[in-house]
């Protein structure tokens, strides 16, 4: 904690200005006022203060606001913001998408997933739901941040939304996100002809059950095998190697790249090595021609 | 290593025949598909023949069809291209080349000359 | 048959520069095209598959684009190892087919 002292008398604070820049530590501690900074935060932007003075300044809000920033204060927190931990900013409501760029803006270029991530979390708690506006804004300004949120958070996302969100904004996605939004998407996208459905839903893909991968093998999508490999594992598996093939199209040739990676090797794994041959692609594997296959889970399930 | 090495070309007359081998090394040969594709002299490549793994499916180019057979023997990992009712047109150097549309490994090639 | 026809049949150019080489089919093939890299006394290299899909190995300057009947492979900037003679051809149906090639030579 910063040194308690009393405020010399010609070091008293009417505004918040450039002359502060060279007021020590325990100065600034001493001679500004809490609920002047933050009536005036607007104005500490644009003051080239140090990150050891920044300190001080956040110390005088924490006190002020024990239980979190009002969003007047938060809106102008500009380069402040980057002395913000997630558990400062769990304590926030933010509603304007004003306030989320000005401060997605501040964090670009710096090493602070977690904050966005809270920071976001916050927006659309304190908005209610994942509407377009916050899509758009979260698109436009950073992209990828989208996948910061938990499933839960992007459960909120109504279908009609879906449109707005852009293939590279679910590059971070995990399993369990797309598992949450490829539901929506197939219901946005659902009266679109079948090219242009699949362009529309190959990014959510990672989230398709097999049922859905199947009946895409019926409609010659050629799909490329990046979005192959972003499947579930379990989507992949129950696929026999004429599906693969024609899921695939032209692009089944790249098969034997991808051939010790997940999820084509568990695919491997549990085809025939016949039924993998006749692809001539040379993939290896299979479960050796003659041997017979049991299927366990099935007394397992009964015992 | 994968290496395709073609033999059996060289110079024969219209109407003979001729049969070439492409001995597959480096990887397991009875689990790819394998064509033929020839380049006459000064001329583009020319796909000839396609077998599939396990022999029981060949496809051939009209200008061949019924005078060339494609035949794979998997035991010894080799290819065949026999080649009957030679005609000056089919002189050309001859690859043999491993995949299944798309050709990923070709041998050096053998020339097969048909000339009276 | 398929027919593939390739322009131009030869360009020059120097290192660095962007270079295009172009494809047409004489049908729909949709994504069903390679673009083959061969240089004298070599055995032709695949470069794309399945129309613009890089294969391993290949150097990110080379990309390939286009569906259905035209399609293009473009150098982005011009290796000296780069010049040879460029192939393209079709597997969507038997039988495969080859363009004639478009030879890059060093200006």
């Known amino acids: 904690d910063v040194e308690r002292t009393t405020c010399p008398p010609e070091k008293e604070v009417h505004e918040i200005d450039e002359s502060l820049i060279f007021y020590k530590k325990r100065e600034l501690e001493a001679c500004v006022d809490a609920a002047l900074l933050a009536a005036q935060m607007d104005r500490v932007d644009a003051i080239p203060f140090t990150y050891e003075q920044l300190d001080v300044l956040k110390h005088k809000l924490d006190e002020l606001y024990p239980q979190g920033y009002p969003e007047s204060v938060i809106r102008h927190l500009g380069h402040l913001f980057l002395k913000m931990s997630p558990e400062d900013i769990r304590k926030w409501n933010v509603t304007s998408l004003e306030t989320l760029k000005a401060l997605l803006k501040v964090s670009k270029g710096h090493e602070m997933s977690a904050q966005v991530a809270t920071l976001i979390d916050r927006v659309v708690v304190g908005r209610g739901q994942l509407d377009k506006d916050t899509v758009d804004t979260l698109t436009a300004f950073c992209p990828g941040c989208l996948c910061s949120l938990s499933p839960e958070r992007l459960s909120s996302v109504p279908p009609s939304v879906i449109g707005a969100v852009r293939p590279q904004d679910l590059d971070t996605c995990g399993p369990r996100q797309l598992d949450v939004l490829y539901p929506k998407a197939r219901l946005a996208f659902q009266n679109m002809s079948g090219s242009e459905y699949f362009v529309k839903i190959r990014p959510f893909l990672g989230g398709a059950p097999t049922e859905d991968v199947k009946a895409l093998s019926q409609q010659n999508v050629s799909m490329d095998l990046a979005t192959f490999m972003k499947l579930r594992r379990e989507a992949v598996l129950p696929l026999t190697v004429a599906e693969v093939q024609k899921l695939l199209g032209p692009h089944v040739e790249g098969l034997k790249v991808e051939e010790q990676h997940s999820p084509v090797r568990d695919w491997i794994l549990k085809q025939r090595q016949d039924d993998l041959d006749t692809l001539g692609l040379g993939l290896q594997g299979g479960i050796p021609n003659g041997y017979l296959i049991l299927d366990l889970s099935v007394r397992e399930a009964l015992s | 290593e994968v290496q395709l090495v073609e033999s059996g070309g060289g110079l024969v007359q219209p109407g003979e025949s001729l049969r070439l081998s492409c001995a597959a090394t480096?990887?397991?040969?009875?689990?790819?598909?394998m064509h033929w594709v020839r380049q006459g002299p000064g001329k583009g490549l020319v796909w000839v023949s396609r077998?599939?793994?396990?022999?029981?499916?060949?496809v051939y180019a009209d200008s061949v069809k019924g005078r060339f057979t494609i035949s794979r023997d998997n035991a010894k990992n080799t290819l065949f291209l026999q080649m009957n009712s030679l005609r000056a047109e089919d002189t050309a150097v001859y690859y043999c080349?491993?995949?299944?549309?798309?050709?990923?490994?070709w041998g050096q090639g053998t020339l097969v000359t048909v000339s009276s | 048959d398929i027919q593939m026809t390739q322009s131009p049949s030869s360009l020059s150019a120097s290192v660095g520069d962007r270079v295009t080489i172009t494809c047409r089919a004489s049908q729909d093939i949709g994504s069903w095209l390679t673009w083959y890299q061969r240089k004298p006394e070599k055995a032709p290299k695949s470069l794309i598959y399945a129309a613009s899909s890089l294969q391993s190995g290949v150097p990110s300057r080379f990309s390939g684009s286009g569906s259905g009947t035209d399609f293009t492979l473009t150098i982005s900037s011009l290796q000296p190892e780069d010049f040879a003679t460029y192939y393209c051809q079709q597997y969507k149906s038997y039988p495969l087919t080859f363009g004639q090639g478009a030879k890059l030579e060093i200006k």
């Open positions: 480096g990887f397991t040969f009875s689990s790819y598909w």
């Open positions: 077998i599939n793994s396990d022999g029981t499916s060949t």
């Open positions: 080349a491993r995949g299944r549309g798309i050709m990923t490994y």
